[in-house]
Structure formats: structure tokens, C-alpha cells
């Protein structure tokens, strides 16, 4: 789904419907330490020398639930996510670099300690680079490693 | 194999409500969304909604917010369909149809549908 | 709601023909479309679904193409048993929307 084509799209972006008080997870992860904004998560990331990934959604996206629902069910997804500073956004960041090819849900990107968007980290599809659906969660599982193994390359 | 078998016929007076079962089995129930499309005599095909049995979340066409809801017992591996309110234009055959074995939203196995006829 | 407008509404072929469906969304719906056929008093059956992937036991005669807005199923050549009314359905956006629907007879 890309948010920039489609007018008054933001008005999915409020948390609308929750059954459970909210979390800052959002549904992708409930044990998992999730950050509140952008902001704080390059902050942790930086200060605390792991990666960051960022998934941006949205709530009445049938791609961003189906998403969010193997993420929140894979044991190996959720244990991998311990090692990330995590942040989850219903809404767009100013900053570009976190959408080089457009600002379509659900989509997931890295971001190294020294604050460098992964550009280089991707999924499988060539229209839409950063885009994952719940069939590729091997690819997102070897992505995430990427992210950390790099990492470990950079120190 | 994948099979997903529905409740039998019903007859309803206008204004009452009809519940409809999808018993499941072959596969993972808790981890595909189960989805719920009619289609009236001789019309096409309309989506009502999912939901995901795994945790009950739903989704809902806003032509029938107010008056559907989708329910999923992980005991029996069965999705019920309840519609309130019934006029004669909900007589229709009504589907389950599940999502992609893994998580994904494309409705890939289909009920053999319930007919359900509102007649005063 | 995304609007899908297929057409023809009804096509008359003969066995062997290359049959061509097409289906236009109103906006973007990037790969989400799926194909179905459904024959009188059955269920529908999945045919195609990210607009281009055959479902597991589908004859290789049925494919589908396109992406964003314009999309087509192909049966390459029509066999007698492929008498039905075909549809399409976009699940990019709430709520998921069909396509009208096109019959397909045997001249």
C-alpha cells in the first residue's frame, strides 16, 4: 500500500481500535522493548552500538496486519529482534533516507549505530525495495543477521 | 487435506439474525485469516470481512460494520459469520474462504457456501 | 472503496482460442489481484493470485498478468471444462473489492 498516493491516508495512522491497552509495540512483539520515536531510537542505537530497525504500517493495511502477524508468531523473528534497538511508526518521519523509494506500508529498514540508513538491505521485490510479506520471513530472518553481522564487521 | 465445510441452509424472517459456521481442517487454524464473501442470486462476489483466529482481530467492509461479527473457536478449529438485522436483500450465498497458507491475505481454499434465504 | 471494472461481462469462444479477461482497478493496487472461476452452483476457485502466481494444481493454460492499475488473465488454449464466470478481486486496501464478472461460453 503506498501512503503517498492515496489522499487522507493519514487518518489510518491513529491506533483506532485498540482491544488491549496500547503498547508501544503495536501488536509486533509484545515482550520485545520498543522505542516511542525516531528521536530516541537513533539516540539508543547510537549510544548503545545496535543496529536499529524500523517498521513503518499501518492499522487498516490487510498487508501491514498480515505482516505484523507472522513477525509477532515467529519464535526466531522475535528472539533475532532482542539484538535491535526496535521502533514501529503509524506515521512518516521527516527524514527522507527512510523512504528512498516511497513512502508505501509495510516496509522495514535499517539503521547502523553510526546512523547510516542500510539502504543496501532489501527484500525481494523491485518496485517496492524495502517491502516484506508474511511469505518472506526467511529473507527478512537473513536480513536481520545482515544487520547485526555488519555491524559487528564496522566495530 | 485442506477443507473447510459450512453449516446447512437457513430460512430467516426479516429483522432477525443468522449465524454461520466454517468448520476447518488440514491446516495451521490459528495462523491464516479466514475471510467472508456473499454473493445474491445471480449477482457477484462481495467481501464482508476476516478475521485471524490466532487472536481474533478483525477487519470488516464498513457496508456491514454495524451489523456483522466474525468470531473464530480455536477449540473446534471452527469461523462463525453472524449477521443481525436481516432484510431481504442479505439472501445470499454466503462463503468462508481462507487466506494463503502462510499468513497472507489472498483467499486461496473456499466453503461450499450457505444459503441463507430472508423471507417474511 | 478501489473500484474493479472487468471486462468483457461475457465472451463467446471456441475450444482451442486464446481467451483474454482484463481487469482495471481504480488506483494503484501494485500485484494484489487475484483471479477466480466459479461454474454454477459451486464455490469459487482460486486460479491466480499476486496478479501472476498459479495456484498449486491450476492447468498451466491459465495465466495473469499486469501490476498498478491494468491486469489479465489468459487461458492460452480454452478447453470445454473452462466454462464459467471468471473474477478478480484486489486485496491491496479495506475492503477487498471483485471484480464484475465475465462468462465465458463455448461457440
Known amino acids: 500500500r503506498d501512503t503517498t498516493v492515496k489522499p487522507g491516508a493519514k487518518k489510518d495512522t491513529k491506533d483506532s481500535r485498540p482491544k488491549l491497552p496500547q503498547t508501544l509495540s503495536r501488536g509486533w512483539g509484545d515482550q520485545l522493548i520498543w522505542t516511542q520515536t525516531y528521536e530516541e531510537a537513533l539516540y539508543k542505537s547510537k549510544t548503545s552500538n545496535k543496529p536499529l530497525m524500523i517498521i513503518h504500517h499501518l492499522d487498516e493495511c490487510p498487508h501491514s496486519q498480515a505482516l505484523k502477524k507472522v513477525f509477532a508468531e515467529n519464535k526466531e523473528i522475535q528472539k533475532l529482534a532482542e539484538q535491535f534497538v526496535l521502533l514501529n511508526l503509524v506515521y512518516e518521519t521527516t527524514d527522507k533516507h527512510l523512504s528512498p523509494d516511497g513512502q508505501y506500508v509495510p516496509r522495514i529498514l535499517f539503521v547502523d549505530p553510526s546512523l547510516t540508513v542500510r539502504a543496501d538491505i532489501t527484500g525481494r521485490y523491485s518496485n517496492r525495495l524495502y517491502a516484506y510479506e508474511p511469505a518472506d520471513t526467511a529473507l527478512l530472518l537473513d536480513n536481520m543477521k545482515k544487520a547485526l553481522k555488519l555491524l559487528k564487521t564496522e566495530l | 487435506q485442506v477443507q473447510l465445510v459450512q453449516s446447512g441452509a437457513e430460512v430467516k424472517k426479516p429483522g432477525a439474525s443468522v449465524k454461520v459456521s466454517c468448520k476447518t481442517s488440514?491446516?495451521?487454524?490459528?495462523?491464516?485469516?479466514m475471510n467472508w464473501v456473499r454473493q445474491a442470486p445471480g449477482q457477484g462476489l462481495e467481501w464482508i470481512g476476516w478475521?485471524?483466529?490466532?487472536?481474533?482481530?478483525?477487519n470488516y467492509n464498513g457496508k456491514f460494520k454495524d451489523r456483522v461479527t466474525l468470531t473464530a473457536d480455536k477449540s473446534t478449529s471452527t469461523v462463525y459469520m453472524e449477521l443481525s438485522s436481516l432484510r431481504s436483500e442479505d439472501t445470499a450465498v454466503y462463503f468462508c474462504?481462507?487466506?494463503?497458507?502462510?499468513?497472507?491475505?489472498?483467499?486461496?481454499?473456499w466453503g461450499q457456501g450457505t444459503l441463507v434465504t430472508v423471507s417474511s | 472503496d478501489i473500484q474493479m471494472t472487468q471486462s468483457p461481462s461475457s465472451l463467446s469462444a471456441s475450444v482451442g482460442d486464446r481467451v483474454t479477461i482484463t481487469c482495471k482497478a481504480s488506483?494503484?493496487?501494485?500485484?494484489?489481484l487475484s483471479w477466480f472461476q466459479q461454474k454454477p452452483g459451486k464455490a469459487p476457485k482460486t486460479l491466480i493470485y499476486?496478479?501472476?502466481r498459479l495456484v498449486d494444481g491450476v492447468p498451466s493454460r491459465f495465466s495473469g498478468s499486469g501490476s498498478g492499475q491494468d491486469f489479465t488473465l489468459t487461458i492460452s488454449s480454452l478447453q470445454p471444462e473452462d466454462i464459467a464466470t471468471y473474477y478478480c478481486?484486489?486485496?491491496?486496501?479495506?475492503?477487498?473489492?471483485f471484480g464484475g464478472g465475465t462468462k465465458v461460453e463455448i461457440k
Open positions: 474462504a481462507r487466506g494463503g497458507y502462510d499468513g497472507s491475505p489472498w483467499l486461496s481454499y
Open positions: 488440514g491446516y495451521v487454524f490459528s495462523r491464516s485469516w
Open positions: 478475521i485471524y483466529p490466532g487472536d481474533g482481530d478483525t
Open positions: 488506483q494503484d493496487i501494485n500485484s494484489y
Open positions: 499476486r496478479a501472476n
Open positions: 478481486l484486489q486485496y491491496d486496501e479495506f475492503p477487498f473489492t
